[in-house]
């Protein structure tokens, strides 16, 4: 036998007990699938979390956080609280990053700014606290006799004296 | 904001056909079902007609079964009622409403009279 | 079909008065609604499934209730309470509404 209640389309609940009627969600519920017993509370956007989408009897709100906050989780499950760049947030709030970290966003962690000497090469710009060194061509790239990166210079045209 | 704007009321002969429209704006209508409602004069509310958001369930009160005819267009957040064989009872205020109940019209008055 | 009785009809009050609508249902019903109409306008829904309060409501109305009886209360009547009151139900087809009570203010 055929449940009746599968036609009963989104936006609606079927009480499987009575006429197996679809009857529209109450206020501030939803149902986004059909064949629903029951209809669930919307949920509601406040404090540090604020409305992005209201909500329907056919889907539920969405929210973001408000400004100075950042999402975390699974649908905005929980709101983060921002930082400047070369910081992060710890249980007594925002603090530096220490020397040889960075973070250039305001959520996450500091990091440790890269080692290029790792990868054989040389510091070419020096890592702060928001940003990360830029590694440049190895030490021997740069030694003696060794070709450069940069193009050499153009040749003069004979007969003209340099200026 | 939420708007819920009937049209299409008037003077009906007994037996006549009228369609009712209602212009909705300030929500995601396609997300919502709705309802006609309807008041006589000097009375209470009777629960007319439903439709869902999309259109796939359709409910009638005995009173109109038959005669009336919801229907709606998302892509014009419009609701409709299709009303035929018009009687004198039929003479109301009629009300389109969201699902929830919390927004309704303003209202369109029919008149069903010789 | 699950008919709506509504007591009084008419109710009288003075400023400052609590007071108490009624609802009975024929049957039982999973919740009810409350809806207010003041005199040529539209119906503007009050207290949902049962003891909600809608946004922009004030705080004086309070519902309550369950199965076949339900009731709705205002704390401290004020004059822009005058209006009609309809308690409606949404669970059990066809949906219906009460026949309404009358409230006016002494």
């Known amino acids: 036998l055929q449940d009746l209640c599968s036609n009963c389309p989104a936006g609606t609940f079927c009480d499987n007990n009575r006429s197996q009627i679809c009857s529209p969600c109450p206020p501030n519920s939803f149902s986004s699938a059909g064949g629903q017993r029951t209809c669930d509370i919307c949920r509601q956007c406040k404090g540090v979390f604020k409305t992005r989408k209201e909500c329907s009897s056919t889907s539920n709100a969405e929210c973001d956080c408000i400004s100075g906050y950042h999402c975390l989780g699974a649908e905005c499950s929980m709101c983060e609280q921002d930082c400047k760049q070369g910081q992060e947030l710890t249980k007594k709030g925002c603090k530096d990053c220490c020397f040889g970290t960075f973070n250039d966003q305001k959520r996450g962690i500091c990091r440790p700014w890269t080692n290029c000497s790792l990868d054989g090469k040389s510091v070419l710009v020096n890592g702060t606290k928001e940003r990360d060194v830029v590694c440049g061509p190895s030490p021997a790239d740069l030694s003696p006799g060794a070709s450069s990166a940069t193009p050499p210079a153009p040749a003069r045209e004979p007969g003209h004296s340099p200026q | 904001d939420v708007q819920l704007v009937e049209s299409g009321g008037g003077l009906v002969q007994p037996g006549g056909s009228r369609k009712l429209s209602c212009a909705a704006s300030g929500f995601s209508f396609s997300s919502f079902g709705m309802h006609w409602v309807r008041q006589a004069p000097e009375k209470g509310l009777e629960w007319v007609a439903y439709i869902s958001s999309g259109s796939s369930t359709i409910y009638y009160a005995d009173t109109v079964k038959g005669r009336f005819t919801i229907s709606r267009d998302n892509p014009k957040n419009t609701l409709f009622l299709q009303m035929t064989s018009l009687r004198s009872e039929d003479t109301a205020m009629y009300y389109c409403v969201r699902d929830w109940t919390d927004y309704w019209g303003q209202g369109t008055t029919l008149t069903v009279s010789t | 079909q699950i008919v709506l009785t509504q007591s009084p009809a008419i109710m009288s009050a003075s400023l400052g008065e609590e007071i108490t609508l009624t609802c009975s249902a024929t049957?039982?019903?999973?919740?009810m609604h409350w809806s207010q109409q003041k005199s040529g306008t539209s119906p503007k829904l009050l207290i949902y499934t049962t003891s909600n309060l809608a946004s922009g409501v004030p705080s004086r109305f309070s519902g309550s209730g369950s199965g076949t009886f339900y009731s709705l209360t205002i704390s401290s009547v004020e004059a822009e309470d005058a209006a009609d009151y309809y308690c409606?139900?949404?669970?059990?087809?066809?949906?219906?509404f009460g026949g309404g009570t009358k409230l006016e203010i002494k």
């Open positions: 049957s039982s019903v999973s919740y």
């Open positions: 409606h139900q949404w669970t059990t087809y066809p949906w219906t």
